[in-house]
């Protein structure tokens, strides 16, 4: 690889723990997404909280190591936890620059492989860009 991995960096107010130490923040100014250059991996992650039909970004940044899923070119989130009734946390890992900025769709909030109501969808060929 010619370059160190660069990911979108975001932490919602009130999230516990920070992944800021897993990279070096780039000085991007105010109107652009914050960017972080990963120190220990070539892998980005994103966490979204799906409540009813609204997805909110919780965290974006660098992973601490390269693990399964990091070879993915795009952010394809899978449901991970139910922090409160009616809400589901979706996470993705991916291994291209800024791949954690967006997702093409969210799978059903039920556990992987089980049917459930569909999350907010992008139109075919589109991506949902998270407003940071």
């Amino acid at each position: 690889p010619p370059n160190r991995r660069t990911c979108v960096f975001f932490e919602a107010p009130g999230v516990r723990g920070s992944t800021k130490t897993l990279g070096e923040l780039l000085d991007t100014g105010t109107e652009l997404p914050r960017a972080i250059r990963c120190l220990y991996s070539r892998c980005c992650f994103g966490i979204w909280n799906l409540t009813q039909d609204r997805a909110q970004v919780e965290m974006q940044g660098c992973r601490d190591s390269d693990e399964p899923g990091c070879e993915s070119l795009h952010c394809d989130p899978s449901p991970r936890a139910h922090p409160s009734p009616g809400s589901t946390l979706f996470t993705c890992s991916c291994g291209t620059d800024f791949c954690n900025a967006n997702y093409s769709h969210l799978p059903p909030p039920g556990s992987p492989g089980t049917p459930g109501s569909q999350g907010p969808q992008a139109a075919p060929g589109e991506s949902i860009w998270m407003a940071l």
Epitope: P2, R4, R5, T6, L32, P33, L39, D97, F98
Partner: antibody, heavy 113, light 112 residues
Framework: QVQLVQSGAEVVKPGASVKMSCKAS????????VSWVKQSPGQGLEWIGE????????NFNEKFKGKATLTVDKSTSTAYMELRRLRSDDTAVFYC??????WGQGVLVTVSS | DVVMTQSPLSLPVTLGQPASISCRSS???????????LEWFQQRPGQSPRRLIY???NRFSGVPDRFSGSGSGTDFTLKISRVEAEDVGVYYC?????????FGQGTKLEIK
Amino acid sequence: QVQLVQSGAEVVKPGASVKMSCKASGYTFTDYWVSWVKQSPGQGLEWIGEIYPKNGVSNFNEKFKGKATLTVDKSTSTAYMELRRLRSDDTAVFYCTRQRDYWGQGVLVTVSS
Amino acid sequence: DVVMTQSPLSLPVTLGQPASISCRSSQSLEYGDGYTYLEWFQQRPGQSPRRLIYGVSNRFSGVPDRFSGSGSGTDFTLKISRVEAEDVGVYYCFQATHDPNTFGQGTKLEIK
């Protein structure tokens, strides 16, 4: 095939600005960083900075902050570098490069009164 | 800034003979992700630089296999197994591990 075609040579006066272009073709412009490199006459190479066309995020050599501004036009797959407050020691060839694997032909900027 | 020091600065070589260029960095170029972001470029007279090697030892597409790169940490080498006339030019090492990225001062290869 991947190509980076840069604008023509410029002769400018001290204190002026210059904006050069780098038109990319043969690949998905938004998927690769575009870097800029300076080569002063008879000298080596100096990394100026880089920009990611998809979102406009840039990363600079501290030495060139305030001197260089990097922008892109995604609709024409073109990267731009503007140099401000030019001095005689800014006389150089400036290259654009796609993550250093493919390079433009260079733009000679001559600063002279 | 990380200083990249090349030697020799001038390298006269007989056609068909091997050539070797050394590059030493002032800090280790092994990054926390396990990769070493060290590259080699060739600049022929009047031309733009051309990437030869990335990641210490990976040849870029279209680069003849007479070019090879090796090394680790702070010491790196570019070798040309048999020099050809078209190899004349200046060779630069480059690091992208630390900001700002930096080039070596260049080694001028000429035919004896």
